[in-house]
Interface confidence: low
């Protein structure tokens, strides 16, 4: 009689993560008598997957009834497959021996490849805010997918970006892979409502790509513009001066009024108005008692926005002149060195 052969008809099997893998194995003879075992990997360090004779293998079921005397089908099913199950599986026939069974013949092996979906892309932006005209980097990461082939695209408000670099790791063969991409985005003053989107397409997603988003509102800082104006007289000896703080983002802002360099009042922006582009406007006013001053008064509106160096604008109030409305442009001056720090 011809010697027993162990036949594994499938050179490779492809299974989606979470599904059940069927690994086929048949023997050509009932002789010699002895159990079958399944291993992952070859050599002495191989991993036992199933032992017909003994042991508990909760994820493994046999296709046919191995207790029947004439059974020659040793196929198994492995449930709830994960990428970690990838590898080459060998169906091995043992010959009854004393005290231990002896390996008699092995099948050629079946390579199990696992198709696994990528995780939801996670997009992260820079740690610190940046101002318009600056270029910032966003990263996108997705993990755990297999096979290796994957497509990643970047969008800003629906427009596809071209300035990005993508790596899929590891470079060689693996049970699963990760993708990491870095995109460069130029900020504009209108980007408070903008979104950056990372889109990942993979064979397991069946044409329905995964998306990760980042709101540029978390990244952008739009510095304010200041305008100081003198309002009409309220009383004979009182002047109302306003400081208009326009087009700033985020809202975190503190304003200090200085009279001739001395702090008069400090307040935090609260009841702001929002512009269509997502930036904010705010106004603060100061009532100045002119009769309390002998000389001209230099009023300064100093704004500290989002923890940045202060920017300020000044207005000269002429005490000698009759307190009527004065235009801000003639008397206003800019502390340019501070402004340079913020922009």
């Amino acid at each position: 009689e011809e010697e027993l052969q162990v036949i594994q008809p499938d050179k490779s099997v492809l299974v989606a993560a979470g599904e059940t893998a069927t690994l086929r194995c048949t023997a050509t003879s009932l002789i010699p008598v002895g159990p079958i075992q399944w291993f992952r990997g070859a050599g002495p360090g191989r991993e036992l997957i199933y032992n017909q004779k003994e042991g508990h293998f909760p994820r493994v079921t046999t296709v046919s009834d191995l207790t029947k005397r004439n059974n020659m089908d040793f196929s198994i099913r492995i449930g709830n497959i994960t990428p970690a199950d990838a590898g080459t599986y060998y169906c091995v026939k043992f010959r009854k021996g004393s005290p231990d069974d002896v390996e008699f013949k092995s099948g050629a092996g079946t390579e199990l490849s696992v198709r696994a979906k990528p995780s939801a892309p996670v997009v992260s932006g820079p740690a610190a805010r940046a101002t318009p005209q600056h270029t910032v980097s966003f990263t996108c990461e997705s993990h755990g997918f297999s096979p290796r082939d994957i497509t990643l695209k970047w969008f800003k408000n629906g427009n596809e970006l071209s300035d990005f670099q993508t790596n899929v790791d590891p470079v060689g063969e693996s049970v699963s892979y990760s993708i990491h991409s870095t995109a460069k985005v130029v900020l504009t003053r209108e980007d408070v409502h903008s979104q950056v989107i990372c889109e990942v397409a993979h064979v397991t997603l069946q044409g329905d790509p995964l998306r990760g988003t980042a709101n540029l509102s978390e990244t952008i800082r739009v510095p304010p513009t200041l305008e100081v104006t003198q309002q009409p007289v309220r009383a004979e000896n009182q002047v109302n001066v306003t400081c208009q703080v326009r087009k700033f983002y985020p809202q975190r802002l503190q304003l200090t009024w200085l009279e001739n360099g001395n702090v008069s009042r400090t307040e935090t922006a609260s009841t702001v108005t929002e512009n269509k582009d997502g930036t904010y406007n705010w106004m603060s006013w100061l009532l100045v008692n002119v009769s309390a001053h002998r000389d001209d008064v230099k009023l300064t509106c100093q704004v500290e926005h989002d923890g940045q160096p202060a920017v300020s604008k000044s207005h000269d109030l002429k005490v000698s002149a009759h307190p009527k409305e004065q235009g801000s442009n003639t008397a206003a001056e800019n502390t340019g060195s501070n402004e340079r720090n913020i922009y």
Epitope: G41, A42, G43, G45, A86, G87, E103, F104
Partner: antibody
Framework: EVQLVESGGGVVQPGRSLRLSCAAS????????MSWVRQAPGKGLEWVAS????????YYADSAKGRFTISRDNSKNTLYLQMNSLRAEDTAVYYC???????????????WGQGTLVTVSS | DIQMTQSPSSVSASVGDRVTITCRAS??????LAWYQQKPGKAPKLLIY???SLQSGVPSRFSGSGSGTDFTLTISSLQPEDFATYYC?????????FGGGTKVEIK
């Protein structure tokens, strides 16, 4: 190109220690079981030790047990063999070798490094 | 431990000859056997694994056969570059063991 380069060999007195290194390149080191095999001058090949892909399992020949330690640093793509209490009979060329199959224990060895000579002599 | 016994320990042959080397395991190892070639001063090179599978890049004049305890390496037509020492190795049980080697010399 797949390359394994051993280093750390030399002349050492009996009872002393030596640490061999094997730098791997050209393949993804962390997917393969690795082994050390030695060859005494004019003699045949003798398996010394093997290590699983993630270092979780280590295997030793009887002649190495208790004296030699195999380890690996996958972040540095390097295999090590720490040899303590060296004896004259440990004199040999020591080869590092890669297991042929990914995610497997040591089985067939391919490729091999060029070897490093360890001479234990007083 | 599984003992691997190679025979002959040396063989003299001419270019073009058919050379057969045998390897016997002290107990059954199924098909878990490899053959290596080693030239003086060089590292061993894998020729055959799983008893009969030819390693990539190895000339087809090399072939392996056998299962269980008895295995054979055959060089169908010896070439000048084939003069070397050949080793068998069992790859199923620890400790991994090699045969003593067969030196193929020029006649």
């Amino acid at each position: 190109e797949v390359q394994l380069v051993e280093s750390g060999g030399g002349v050492v007195q009996p009872g002393r220690s030596l640490r061999l290194s094997c730098a791997a390149s050209g393949f993804t080191f962390s997917y393969y079981g690795m082994s050390w095999v030695r060859q005494a001058p004019g003699k045949g090949l003798e398996w010394v030790a093997s290590i699983w892909v993630d270092g979780s399992n280590k295997y030793y020949a009887d002649s190495a047990k208790g004296r030699f330690t195999i380890s690996r640093d996958n972040s540095k793509n390097t295999l090590y063999l720490q040899m303590n209490s060296l004896r004259a009979e440990d004199t040999a060329v020591y080869y590092c070798a890669e297991g042929k199959e990914t995610y497997s224990g040591p089985n067939w060895f391919d490729p091999w490094g060029q070897g490093t000579l360890v001479t234990v002599s007083s | 431990d599984i003992q691997m016994t190679q025979s002959p320990s040396s063989v003299s042959a001419s270019v073009g000859d058919r050379v057969t080397i045998t390897c016997r395991a002290s107990q059954g190892i199924s098909s878990w056997l490899a053959w290596y070639q080693q030239k003086p001063g060089k590292a061993p090179k894998l020729l055959i694994y799983a008893a009969s599978s030819l390693q990539s890049g190895v000339p087809s004049r090399f072939s392996g056969s056998g299962s269980g305890t008895d295995f054979t390496l055959t060089i169908s037509s010896l070439q000048p570059e084939d003069f070397a020492t050949y080793y068998c190795q069992q790859a199923i049980y620890f400790p991994i063991t090699f045969g003593g080697g067969t030196k193929v010399e020029i006649k």
